[in-house]
């Protein structure tokens, strides 16, 4: 025997109180699949959340965050405060990155600068709170005879003082 509720489409629920008639979901509720025995209450995008997509009888509302905040979690379940580049969010608010660390985004934590020497490279551009260091060629690449980005300075002849 087929369940009479299986005929109820999305946007309705199977009303046991009314001989399993398919009743439409009331305002502020939805059913996204057929055969449902209840309508789910729509998500409310309040406070720091704002409505990205209105609730309909067949789909839930979707929220995002007001300017100055960004989404965290599945389906934007939380809003977290933005910080500036060069900062990270702590329990006491936005704090500048410590020396030796950087953050090039408005969210997330400060990360250590790349250690160029681990790859046998030299530092080409120093790091800042907002930017990682840029590693250059390895010192070996800069030795005489090796092709290099910047040619070595010409050697002075012995016995000649600079002019």
């Amino acid at each position: 025997l087929q369940d009479p509720c299986s005929n109820c489409p999305a946007g309705t629920f199977c009303d046991n109180n009314r001989n399993q008639i398919c009743s439409p979901c009331p305002p502020n509720s939805f059913s996204s699949a057929g055969g449902q025995r209840t309508c789910d209450i729509c998500r409310q995008c309040k406070g720091v959340f704002r409505t990205r997509k209105e609730c309909s009888s067949t789909s839930n509302a979707e929220c995002d965050c007001t300017p100055g905040f960004h989404c965290l979690g599945a389906g934007c379940s939380m809003c977290e405060q933005d910080c500036k580049q060069g900062q990270e969010l702590t329990k006491k608010g936005c704090k500048d990155c410590c020396f030796g660390t950087f953050n090039d985004q408005k969210r997330g934590i400060c990360r250590p600068w790349t250690n160029c020497s681990l790859d046998g490279k030299s530092v080409l551009v120093n790091g800042t709170k907002e930017r990682d260091v840029v590693c250059g060629p390895s010192p070996a690449d800069l030795s005489p005879g090796a092709s290099s980005v910047t040619p070595p300075a010409p050697a002075r002849e012995p016995g000649h003082s600079p002019q």
Partner: nanobody
Framework: EVQLVETGGGLIQPGGSLRLSCAAS????????MSWVRQAPGKGLEWVSV???????YYADSVKGRFTISRDNSKNTLYLQMNSLRAEDTAVYYC????????????????????RGQGTTVTVSS
């Protein structure tokens, strides 16, 4: 005995206003989720508006900006103020007590109405 009695219907010209009342007995309106629903001739039930126990109100798109649901706790009465009435608002209007899952003011799911009045007829015609 739990009962709902609607009044205030009638014949009204397009663009006019009406206020429907729903007097409740046997339970407290303010601590329940209450709805107005309507049934146009030859059509199924259509939800019009809902008021939650915390006072939050919600409306069908077809009446948004024209109808207002409210309640008077001292009179244990639910109201529906209907403005800018249109021919398509012609229907029998019922108030109902709704059944929701969830605690307090934060329902999570709706599963039908358990009490409904006998209805009041609204006819919008010139």
């Amino acid at each position: 005995e739990v009962q709902l009695v609607e009044t205030g219907g009638g014949l009204i010209q397009p663009g006019g206003s009406l206020r429907l009342s729903c007097a409740a007995s046997g339970f407290t309106v303010s601590s329940n989720y209450m709805s107005w629903v309507r049934q146009a001739p030859g059509k199924g039930l259509e939800w019009v508006s809902v008021i939650y126990s915390d006072g939050s109100t919600y409306y069908a798109d077809s009446v948004k900006g024209r109808f207002t649901i409210s309640r008077d706790n001292s009179k244990n009465t639910l109201y529906l103020q209907m403005n800018s009435l249109r021919a398509e608002d012609t229907a029998v209007y019922y108030c109902a007590r709704d059944r929701y899952y969830g605690s307090g003011n934060y329902p999570t799911a709706y599963y039908g109405m358990d009490v409904r009045g006998q209805g009041t007829t609204v006819t919008v015609s010139s």
